[in-house]
């Protein structure tokens, strides 16, 4: 959670002299309450906007907008405190609008905006606008709060921001997974334009369960430059387990900008549909009997196998 370094934020507008100051999130009116305090903000709105830094990097920002209520309390309005709380880390950042002149009229509705809080992909924030001075301890609250959920890097506009690109958002592996004979999966995906290794993580599940019945990890060495953007094909051997039929294939890249924390892509193969009507009993005897007591779950000594090649 940080403030955009460029351009300098502005809160002055026609009819109001104002400056933006950093704030400790603890306005003096908390400690020294005033008798007369303004009413709360009206129509607080938070939207996702995007802004460039001086270095040319693109970041998501919270665009905060609110209006004043059309009452006489604007005569006592000395400014506003804007506070952004990141829910998962409890980090809070505040700025203060300090009014250097008095608001005297409501010829038009007063509207304020601020777009300098840089936010992170896939994070949740509580945005609060407090009118200043803050109310006496038992006074009516004069703040408004709203939650703001920032989309993750799958979002079209987010994809091209610097934090998302750093985590590999521009790579689209276009994964395809097909089931082959003899308990095998063929995984195909497009390599990125970086000489870095990949990992394929295969997790298999029974039809309606979330506890895995088979896991396998396959390492793909770094491609050569002539293999960039080519398809890589990998054949994974599955465990021959009855009912262990839903397969999740996850591809983890290790790009230099994100190392072991890059965005992963996955594809899932569902279990084959069960026929609605029972199958007719065959008029021949099977060549084997199902082994009684056989386990549908993985044994540590029974590993899957795989092989791969890059396709040009």
């Amino acid at each position: 959670l940080r403030l955009l370094d460029f351009p300098a934020p502005v809160c002055a507008q026609e009819g109001l002299s104002c400056r933006v100051k950093n704030s400790t999130c603890l306005d003096d009116s908390w400690i020294h309450p005033r008798n007369l305090t303004p009413s709360s903000p009206k129509d607080l709105q938070i939207q996702l906007h995007f802004a460039h830094t001086q270095q040319g990097d693109l970041f998501p920002v919270a665009h905060i907008e609110w209006t004043l209520q059309t009452d006489a309390s604007i005569l006592y309005l000395e400014g506003a405190e804007l506070s952004v709380l990141q829910l998962n880390t409890n980090e809070r950042l505040c700025v203060r609008f300090e009014f250097l002149s008095k608001l005297r009229h409501h010829h038009r509705r007063w509207r304020f905006t601020f777009s300098h809080f840089v936010v992170d992909p896939d994070q949740e924030y509580e945005v609060t606008v407090h009118h200043l001075p803050k109310p006496i301890p038992d006074g009516d609250p004069n703040h408004q709060s709203k939650n703001f959920l920032v989309p993750d890097c799958e979002h079209a506009r987010m994809k091209v921001t610097t934090p998302c690109m750093s985590s590999g958002s521009l790579w689209d592996p276009n994964i395809t997974v097909e089931t082959l004979e003899a308990h095998q999966l063929r995984v195909s995906f497009t390599l990125w334009n970086e000489s870095t290794h990949y990992q394929i993580l295969l997790t298999s599940f029974p039809h309606m369960e979330n506890h895995s019945c088979f896991e396998h990890m396959h390492h793909i060495p770094a491609p050569r430059p002539e293999e960039f953007h080519q398809r890589s094909n990998v054949t994974l051997t599955l465990r021959n387990l009855k009912g262990c039929c839903r397969h999740q294939v996850q591809i983890q890249p290790f790009f230099s900008s994100c190392l072991n924390d890059c965005l992963r892509h996955s594809a899932t193969v569902s279990c084959p549909e069960m026929p609605d009507t029972p199958e007719p009993i065959p008029d021949y005897m099977p060549l084997w009997e199902p082994r009684s007591g056989s386990s549908d779950y993985k044994d540590d000594d029974d590993k899957g196998s795989s092989h791969h090649h890059h396709h040009h």
Partner: antibody, heavy 118, light 107 residues
Amino acid sequence: EVQLVESGGGSVQPGGSLRLSCAASGFTFSSYSMNWVRQAPGKGLEWVSIISSRSSIIHYADSVKGRFTISRDNAKNSLYLQMNSLRDEDTAVYYCARPKVGGGMDVWGQGTTVTVSS
Amino acid sequence: DIQMTQSPSSLSASVGDRVTITCRASQGISNYLAWYQQKPGKFPELLIYAASTLQSGVPSRFSGSGSGTDFTLTISSLQPEDVATYYCQKYNRAPFTFGPGTKVDIK
């Protein structure tokens, strides 16, 4: 001294209700999100719910969604958990916990015990 | 929802041993991971946050590492007072799920 003190636990029949409270002191309560975490006898920790500092963000674990309601009163430095339609599996020690700036929960109450049994 | 797993579920080690506990997230959670120690009959205590930052007051024999999906808590030299259950917790986004715990005792 930073302190959280839970109260309101007790025994209740399945389908019944209880309201837990957590009294905070020694810090600016209104600046922090707050959590409830529970622990069934002999089991691990289970995160239950979070409420942001101004109550505009609330989340629940799937296991309690629709039955539990988290709330707070910043003027009273208090956090609450209203528990309805209680089930046997809600039997646990319930802790309120304050998040640390940067992540994790660094201040915990001593816990209050809820027993759901017929 | 993201699942958290821990291994081993329990371990016994001698005083002075190096102990390693691993925590795995089913999807990447960046470094949004905390470790807690809970002694029998007590409330949990925060040991590590942001995957590798030691909470103030926690002995330096505790350390954390990892990012993305795989995380490790290491006790460099196990002490008798370290007998406890250790939990990881992810906090990238709600729900802030805990791992199932690893019980550590002395041989």
